[in-house]
């Protein structure tokens, strides 16, 4: 009972029930209409047949589909369900009495006025484009602008409320009962999104009569989520009339699938969320609407929310990075596929592996850090887009490097210092993802120290001089030695070597000019001297 491509939804009466089965294809977009049978008499057992609404978004690559209708025909979605089987004649006014009259049905007062959810996430709707080439969500859904269709099995019962008078003629051939004829009837609902109404079409029964009218003339302009009870159905070749109930589904354009994946988790997670737009839950019984979502190849991950439509996030975690997943997201109406979206989602780039750096043979003020080219493991890590190299002694400096370099000369270092180098690889996906930092360390070689600071000379006695100073800003080596050279008239007088800069020079000549030169030696190199001139006094004695 696959309908021809014609934007329709369908229902059937008194269907034979099959065991529940619902194969969800991987990487295929079906156009075969789904169908459901709901058995009457209180049973809610259902039968599924695969089906889908399919519209490829422009940024998606179409999936193979040998059954896709030609461009000339609209995509179809068929919904099949068996409506409830009324067994009693309604009292006059049946289910149609307004409040205050006999037979009134009380309207629940607790139904919220409007529980539609705001659409605040960018919808994966037609003509949208993926935010990032590394995490694209490709939605296939029926182009309901031209209509969608659904098929339901509707149970029938004897038309006890029928207005046809009983026949008094004895026929020589027994007519088939209308209950039997309409017991398996398929009703195709075609959605007209332009005016948001449905047309119902009773399939496989010629010249079906709804009451006194041709059914095809009256089963149109049906409001979504409406419920029509005790419709008298018959045709020329059956008697007596039987009744069916119709449950018109919500418009398929009321549902949209949204990508709710947090950017931070987009490499290992897929989050999808059905949202409703302009779906009036005062009218539409949310208990009739449910959803199923799962993604291949992760067979075990499935989100199911049955019996009530509470738009909530379905997040599948622990997925592989940079992997194509085919996700099947379905909205079920009374247990039947109303909307089925097949979405291709590629998880974001994975965390890259960082190669181990080598710190090389350092000089006093620079060293070469090098690392091997990363071996790409596409199943787990992504090829880096670049590197961040940091080096620190007390403070840290970092440098961003392109992904085509495998070495970097670190310059402007301080001599004779311990440095730690960290290298991390990163990728730019929805966010920048950094690999684990790998480290190496080194010690720069010694270099000439700076000059001593704050050199002072003083004359405690007529023929002695005190010399003091502070350490250099940078000693640049392992040891601390202060060297004092005393000169007079350009000639060497004496030399001192101490580990602190406090020199007492006595027994100098009276009334003589001296030159005092202090330098620092770090055990490897000697620095420049600082010079002070001082004269001894005449001998006061």
């Amino acid at each position: 009972q696959t309908p021809t491509p014609s934007d329709e939804l369908s229902t059937t009466e008194n269907a034979l029930l099959l065991p529940q089965s619902d194969p969800l294809p991987a990487r295929t977009t079906e156009s075969t209409p789904p169908s459901i049978s709901e058995r009457g008499n209180g049973s809610s057992e259902t039968t599924y047949h695969p089906g889908v609404l399919s519209t490829l978004l422009p940024h998606l690559s179409p999936q193979p589909d040998s059954q896709t209708p030609s461009a000339g025909g609209a995509d179809t979605q068929t919904f099949s369900s068996q409506a409830d089987n009324p067994t009693l004649t309604p009292a006059p006014g049946g289910g149609t009495d307004p409040p205050g009259v006999p037979g009134e049905r009380t309207v629940p007062g607790t139904i919220p006025a409007d529980t539609a959810f705001p659409v605040d996430t960018p919808s994966l709707a037609r003509n949208s484009s993926a935010a990032s080439p590394t995490h694209t969500s490709n939605v296939s859904t029926t182009d309901i602008s031209s209509g969608a269709s659904l098929t339901t099995l509707t149970p029938s019962t004897l038309g006890l409320a029928s207005t046809d008078p009983p026949s008094t003629t004895i026929a020589t051939t027994t007519k088939q009962t209308c209950a039997a004829m309409f017991g398996n009837i398929t009703v195709n609902y075609t959605y007209e999104s332009s005016n948001q109404t449905f047309k119902a079409d009773l399939k496989d029964v010629q010249n079906a009569k709804c009451g006194n009218e041709d059914c095809e003339n009256v089963l149109n302009n049906l409001e979504e989520c409406s419920q029509i009870k005790n419709i008298s159905v018959s045709n020329d070749s059956c008697a007596p009339a039987t009744t069916i109930d119709l449950y018109v589904p919500p418009g398929t354009d009321k549902f949209s699938l949204h990508d709710c994946t947090p950017k931070e988790k987009a490499n290992t997670s897929i989050c999808l969320e059905w949202k409703t737009k302009n779906l009036d839950f005062r009218k539409c019984n949310s208990d009739n609407i449910s959803y199923v979502l799962h993604c291949e190849p992760e067979n075990n991950t499935k989100c199911i929310r049955r019996n009530t439509f509470i738009p909530e996030r379905c997040q599948l975690d622990n997925l592989r990075a940079q992997t194509n997943y085919t996700c099947v997201a379905e909205i079920l109406y009374r247990g039947v596929k109303l909307v089925k979206n097949v979405i291709n989602v590629q998880t974001d780039l994975g965390i890259p592996e960082t190669p181990k750096p080598s710190c090389g043979d350092p000089a006093a003020r620079k060293t070469l850090v090098s690392w091997p080219e990363p071996v790409s493991k596409p199943e787990s890590a992504s090829k880096p887009h670049g590197y961040v190299l940091c080096y620190k002694n007390n403070s840290e400096k970092c440098k961003s490097l392109p992904n085509n370099v495998t070495s970097f000369e670190v310059e402007s270092l301080k001599p004779y210092k311990y440095y730690e180098v960290s290298l991390l690889a990163y990728v730019n996906g929805k966010i920048q993802r950094n690999g684990t930092a790998e480290k190496c360390n080194f010690h720069t070689k010694a270099d000439r120290p700076d000059k001593v600071n704050g050199m002072k000379t003083s004359r405690p006695t007529d023929n002695s001089i005190n010399v003091t100073c502070g350490p250099p800003y940078e000693t640049n080596g392992p040891k601390t030695f202060y060297i004092l050279v005393v000169r007079s008239g350009g000639s060497f007088v004496t030399k001192y070597n101490k580990t602190n800069c406090q020199f007492y020079v006595d027994n100098l000549y009276y009334s003589t000019d001296y030159e005092f030169l202090v330098s620092f030696h770090n055990g490897v190199y000697e620095g420049d001297s600082v010079i002070r001139n001082e004269s001894t006094n005449f001998n006061a004695k």
Epitope: G95, T96, P98, P99, R105, V107, P108, I111, T163, T197, K209, C210, G211, N212, E213, D214, C215, N217, V218, L219, N220, N221, L222, E223, C225, S226, Q227, I228, K229, N230, I231, S232, T243, L246, Y247, V248, F281, R282, K283, C284, N285, S286, N288
Partner: nanobody
Framework: QVQLVESGGGLVHPGDSLRLSCAAS????????MGWYRQSPGSQRELVAT??????TYADSVKGRFTISRDNAKNIVYLQMNSLKPEDTAVYYC??????????????WGQGTQVTVSG
């Protein structure tokens, strides 16, 4: 919103016929039940006849005498009343009722048209 305007009421003799019309405008759907109710002084409003997707329902008191029909293209519901009796005298109200799968239903009423059957 749905607006309903009735017409066709009047004063007739017992046994005569009368045809009431109710024109609906606004958000009118074929899935809604349209019908006629009547109320005579001192009584409650009672069902006369309803129709939805071609299927009519009648009160026992009018079966065989009244016929309800609906022109979906024009959104008009008619009540053909034959063999009128004095007890059919009442104000006749047109009703539009949408019933939903949630159990919620919404009613709209016309202003009413007077039918008087007197000999």
């Amino acid at each position: 919103q749905v607006q309903l305007v009735e017409s066709g009421g009047g004063l007739v003799h017992p046994g005569d016929s009368l045809r009431l019309s109710c024109a609906a405008s606004g958000s009118v759907f074929n899935s809604a039940t349209m019908g006629w109710y009547r109320q005579s002084p001192g009584s409650q409003r009672e069902l006369v006849a309803t129709i939805v997707v071609g299927t009519p329902t009648y009160a026992d008191s009018v079966k065989g005498r009244f016929t309800i029909s609906r022109d979906n293209a024009k959104n008009i519901v008619y009540l053909q009343m034959n063999s009128l009796k004095p007890e059919d005298t009442a104000v006749y109200y047109c009703n539009y009722r949408a019933t939903y799968t949630s159990g919620y239903s919404r009613d709209y009423w016309g202003q009413g048209t007077q039918v008087t059957v007197s000999g």
